[in-house]
């Protein structure tokens, strides 16, 4: 039961995390105009990965997409790539984890296959979360560097009187959404990996002994069945298979690779 809960919770946490990564990637507020210690303007600037926006105090907002690929900073391209990779891996991980969920029965899928899928999705979630955290952190670092450079320009008066007001940018809401979402995806992935350990049938518990009788052969396995069958006394295996939606007939009609005849 604990394994099912861990797997289910890992899936839900990862789902929320990936939704957050998608939201952060689409958000326009990756960087917002720094209002502290600046002249009060009637115009507010903010920028995303895909477009930059200007909100006037009149309420009019204008957004312009970055309609160039080659003209964009390499760092911005790298952040975009990291976020997209994170989303793609997360989406694939979600797809895999749906089939791996213990509460969902798909055909004759073995528990070892579910364990492998759970581990795969867990790893994908971990990498997805790391990609998002890395992407957001790279962007944040870029902002910090530019912030202090523009502050230095402001106070040292480099290059004399410039024709544009030095607009400084600080952390936008999308960065915090990205960090939290990346963290949640990472946590979800770790939970899936932990659940996988509980799902995977241990070799020592499945070393069945074959007794050859005349005319037919029967395999006796210690544990591995639901408690109601009365077979075996291995509490660990009972715990794992408790709550499973299988009947005794199902177990018998779909032998696994651990059944030795």
């Amino acid at each position: 039961m604990a394994v099912t809960a861990c797997q289910g919770l890992g899936f839900v946490v990862s789902l929320i995390g990936i939704a957050g990564i998608i939201a952060a990637t689409c958000m326009d507020q990756w960087s917002t105009q720094d209002l502290y210690n600046n002249p009060v303007t009637a115009v507010f600037n903010y920028q995303g990965l895909w477009r930059s926006c200007v909100r006037e105090s009149s309420g009019f907002t204008e957004c312009r997409g970055y309609f160039t690929l080659l003209g964009l900073p390499a760092m911005l391209q790298a952040v975009r790539a990291l976020m997209i990779v994170g989303i793609v891996l997360g989406a694939i991980g979600l797809l895999v984890s749906i089939f791996a969920l213990k509460c969902i029965r798909i055909g004759s899928m073995e528990d070892s296959a579910k364990a492998n899928m759970t581990l795969t999705s867990g790893i994908m979630f971990i990498v997805s979360g790391l990609c998002a955290i890395a992407g957001v952190s790279v962007f944040a670092n870029m902002l910090v560097t530019n912030f202090w450079m523009s502050t230095a320009n402001m106070y040292t008066g480099m290059g004399g009187m410039v024709q544009t007001v030095q607009t400084r940018y600080t952390f936008g809401a999308a960065l915090f959404v990205g960090w939290v979402a990346g963290g949640l995806t990472l946590i979800g992935g770790v939970m899936m990996c932990i659940a996988c350990r509980g799902l995977a049938p241990e070799e020592t518990n499945y070393k069945a002994v074959s007794y050859h009788a005349s005319g037919h052969s029967v395999a006796y396995k210690p544990g591995g069945f639901k408690a109601s069958t009365g077979f075996g006394s291995n509490t660990k295996n009972k715990k794992i298979y408790d709550g499973g939606a299988r009947t005794e007939d199902e177990v018998q009609s779909y032998p696994s690779k651990h059944d030795y005849v």
Epitope: P39, V43, N45, S58, F60, E62, T164
Partner: antibody
Framework: QVQLVQSGAEVKKPGASVKVSCKPS????????IDWVRQAPGQGLEWMGG????????VYNEKFQGRVTLTADKSSSTAYMELSSLRSEDTAVYFC???????????WGQGTLVTVSS | DIVMTQSPDSLAVSLGERATINCKSS????????????LTWYQQKPGQPPKLLIY???TRESGVPDRFSGSGSGKDFTLTISSLQAEDVAVYYC?????????FGGGTKVEIK
């Protein structure tokens, strides 16, 4: 069409207060900021402040801070400008205006003459 | 506060001739976010409220004749009336729409020579 109708002329004594109203029509009252601009006789234009009728948020010219209060009544779709501690130099025509894109003022009230005299 | 300096104070131009009004800001009104200059031009006739002519330094308001044009960027701006008409006699104001408080220039009176 968009119209901003202001209250009539006022004559006040120094130290008194005046409250000028501005009733816009022809658009959704809460969708645009209302600004107040004054013009002393034979002088130029001076921005006093602005209010967002939807949220009630205000921004003031520091020159008038503490003396001017901008309010908006959504139920009657009317904006108000109250100027206290009146002085003779406050004698001017007070305009309300609608703020649009570019933070510019596209529609103006007809103006309200406030005369401060002892 | 941003100081808006208009020149000349008054201008006499013959009908059909070009009239040019200058406006200088103490700080740049160019917003780096959208590369727009937050400067507006108004026309005010005696006994009337001001009328919006041009916003974003060069965008003509709908209904404004195309003989009115705005140009300039950063700190220096110009309003040009390509062919002065009798109805253009008025006082013209520039306004900073970027920094609070929103300040106006002193005005330029345009008359017919």
């Amino acid at each position: 069409q968009v119209q901003l109708v202001q209250s009539g002329a006022e004559v006040k004594k120094p130290g008194a207060s005046v409250k000028v109203s501005c009733k816009p029509s022809g658009y959704a009252f809460t969708n645009y900021l209302i600004d107040w601009v004054r013009q002393a006789p034979g002088q130029g234009l001076e921005w006093m402040g602005g209010i967002n009728p939807g949220s009630g948020d205000t921004v003031y010219n520091e020159k008038f801070q503490g003396r001017v209060t901008l309010t908006a009544d959504k139920s009657s779709s009317t904006a108000y400008m109250e100027l206290s501690s009146l002085r003779s130099e406050d004698t001017a025509v007070y305009f309300c205006a609608r703020r649009v894109r570019g933070n510019s003022f596209d529609s103006w009230g007809q103006g309200t003459l406030v005369t401060v005299s002892s | 506060d941003i100081v808006m300096t208009q020149s000349p104070d008054s201008l006499a131009v013959s009908l059909g001739e070009r009239a040019t009004i200058n406006c200088k800001s103490s700080q740049s009104l160019l917003n780096s976010g959208n590369q727009k200059n937050y400067l507006t031009w108004y026309q005010q006739k005696p006994g009337q409220p001001p009328k919006l002519l041009i916003y974003w330094a060069s965008t003509r308001e709908s209904g404004v004749p195309d003989r009115f044009s705005g140009s300039g960027s950063g700190k220096d701006f110009t309003l040009t009336i390509s062919s002065l008409q009798a109805e253009d006699v008025a006082v013209y104001y520039c306004q900073n729409n970027y920094f609070y408080p929103l300040t106006f220039g002193g005005g330029t009176k345009v008359e017919i020579k």
